[in-house]
Interface confidence: medium
């Protein structure tokens, strides 16, 4: 079953807001003047990271020697992070004695850069997407997904890891961003808000969507994630916004119906294989792309983000199930598990379609402020 589509011909923001056309250029604040993040109404603005030491690139990540075994993502400084996990934060938590097991918490101190210096990098994720400022790149071809329609067996591991719900994917799910840019899917997870509060990580014109799915991929140039961390294009994430629609989404229901089983932090269950591509929008040709980072520590940069223009529709009940079932650290609900949007710092978001073209009658000429940087790729 294909997923319901948002308005096919309007860039993101138009379909979700009910408007027939996207915002005109005159409605946009300049990048320099805009706040670091546009929070949904009622959400406290978070302290900025502008005064933190910038970090252009993540230091090279080298595996441990063979004698020591491979590098683990959890080999990060030990920190204590009390605080209210109900508020979205750029902060993390790592249990003091949890040698190789780390637990990220949204909320509390210290700032993430103290946990992983890369979190203070200049090219972080998520970001606010402004279609009018995106560079149209005809070289960005439709995404290619192979092997995403999984049989029921073997079953897949669905886990509440304390900061999201994560589905571990088996080998064989291949994705290509373009010729020679081939990846293997590793896992998918979701970000969400709370009752009446949206929780997507990326925003569009400052608009936050109810939720967001991330499918994390490893470049075929690398054998292991630790080798790819911080390397340009080492990891790629497909991201799609989840919105409220009139009907139940049967693909998502296969996962959402199992959340009660993993309500506790650290719990997991096995779910039959499913069509992973059915969790994504059906239009693989229209998307935004930029280079950013992981949105949780270690915040490694060099991650290629592909954010679909089309959204995925879930019923109101399904969105409520997602945001109101799971529990995180410290007997707190697992909610609002998104990072604040990060400054672009000169990055240009590219679009595979003319997202900056205003189709409304008042636009005499297409507006396209940035040129494509990847035309020759």
């Amino acid at each position: 079953q294909r997923l319901p589509r948002m308005q096919e011909d309007s860039p993101l923001g138009g379909g979700s807001s009910g408007e027939d056309d996207p915002l005109g250029e005159e409605d946009l604040p300049s990048e320099e003047d805009s706040p670091r993040e546009e929070d949904p109404p009622g959400e406290e603005d978070l302290p900025g990271e502008e005064d933190l030491p910038g970090e252009e690139d993540l230091p090279e990540v080298k595996p441990k020697s063979e004698e020591e075994g491979s590098l683990k993502l959890e080999d990060l400084p030990t920190v204590e992070a009390p605080g209210d996990p109900q508020e979205p934060q750029n902060n993390a938590h790592r249990d003091k004695e949890g040698d190789d097991q780390s637990h990220w918490r949204y909320g509390g101190d210290p700032p993430w850069p103290r946990v992983s210096p890369a979190c203070a990098g200049r090219f972080q994720s998520p970001v606010d997407i402004r279609p009018q400022l995106a560079a149209f790149c005809p070289a960005l071809r439709p995404l290619e997904l192979l092997g995403f329609q999984l049989p029921p067996l073997p079953e897949l591991r669905l886990r509440n890891n304390g900061h999201s719900v994560q589905l571990t994917l088996p080998p064989g799910l291949e994705m290509a961003l373009g010729p020679g840019r081939e990846y293997r899917a590793l896992q998918l997870h979701l970000h969400w808000g709370a009752a009446g509060r949206p929780g997507s990580e990326h925003t569009v014109e400052g608009h936050r969507f109810p939720a967001e799915i991330h499918v994390v991929h490893l470049s075929t140039a690398f054998a292991r994630v630790d080798e790819a961390l911080g390397r340009p294009g080492g990891l790629a994430v497909l991201a799609a916004f989840l919105e409220e629609g009139p009907e139940e989404n049967s693909a998502y229901e296969q996962l959402l119906s199992r959340l009660e089983e993993i309500a506790e932090e650290g719990s997991e269950t096995q779910v039959p294989g499913l069509d992973i591509s059915a969790l994504l929008p059906s239009d693989f040709s229209r998307y935004f792309q930029y280079e950013g980072s992981l949105t949780t520590p270690p915040c490694a940069q060099g991650v290629i983000w592909t954010v679909f223009n089309q959204t995925v529709m879930l019923s109101a009940k399904q969105l409520h199930t997602l945001s109101d079932t799971l529990w995180g650290p410290g007997d707190s609900r697992l909610q609002l598990n998104f990072r604040a949007t990060q400054p672009l710092n000169g990055r240009v978001i590219e679009a595979s379609f003319p997202a900056g073209v205003d189709s409304s009658p008042r636009a005499a000429e297409p507006v396209q402020l940035n040129s494509c940087l990847a035309a020759g790729d």
């Epitope: 003091k96 994390v216 506790e264 719990s267 096995q270």
Partner: antibody, heavy 124, light 107 residues
Framework: QVQLQESGPGLVKPSETLSLTCTVS????????WSWIRQPPGKGLEWIGY???????NYNPSLKSRVTISVDTSKNQFSLKLSSVTAADTAVYYC??????????????????WGQGTTVTVSS | DIQMTQSPSSVSASVGDRVTITCRAS??????LAWYQQKPGKAPKLLIY???SLQSGVPSRFSGSGSGTDFTLTISSLQPEDFATYYC?????????FGPGTKVDIK
Amino acid sequence: QVQLQESGPGLVKPSETLSLTCTVSGGSISSYYWSWIRQPPGKGLEWIGYIYSSGSTNYNPSLKSRVTISVDTSKNQFSLKLSSVTAADTAVYYCARDQHSSSFYYYYYGMDVWGQGTTVTVSS
Amino acid sequence: DIQMTQSPSSVSASVGDRVTITCRASQGISSWLAWYQQKPGKAPKLLIYAASSLQSGVPSRFSGSGSGTDFTLTISSLQPEDFATYYCQQANSFPLTFGPGTKVDIK
């Protein structure tokens, strides 16, 4: 350095409940999975089940109806109860730390720390 | 349940020999496989995790390979302290299951 120590009676009567405790020293029980494994005399290893520090459990279906694993984080201990035992439950019982990554991608690091094992004989 | 089989069930070898033990899963388990060494009267010891990653403190003569259903543990040059029983274990699906073991003894 994390160490595990099993404790409990070495002899249990048939139809009774076997109770064992594993004490974690040199580190915290938090943020890990903790497994029980057994090994009948002269045979291989059988996973009984595990518990996460938050209290969530997963059991071997072959033993699920008889097994309860619990955790006491304040004492840095986790426990095994196996009800309605028979002679087939005679084995060396081990506790172990089981490392499943809870980072942004799944990774399995194996059972890296084991107790020395305790022999439990089921006999009248 | 995923069944794990090992071959050979036992192997006689001499110090300095190269020893290879294979483990096969009844269905694909990605790379979620660990290898353990157990000596009589002792608890198992983790050697390899994630199919090919060497556990800290384990000599580099031990190596693991494989993915999917077929895996191999290799001891490049057998040492006197390596005579033991070796078990593989999968962590792809519940219940976690072990292979029946391979006993490496002195020829």
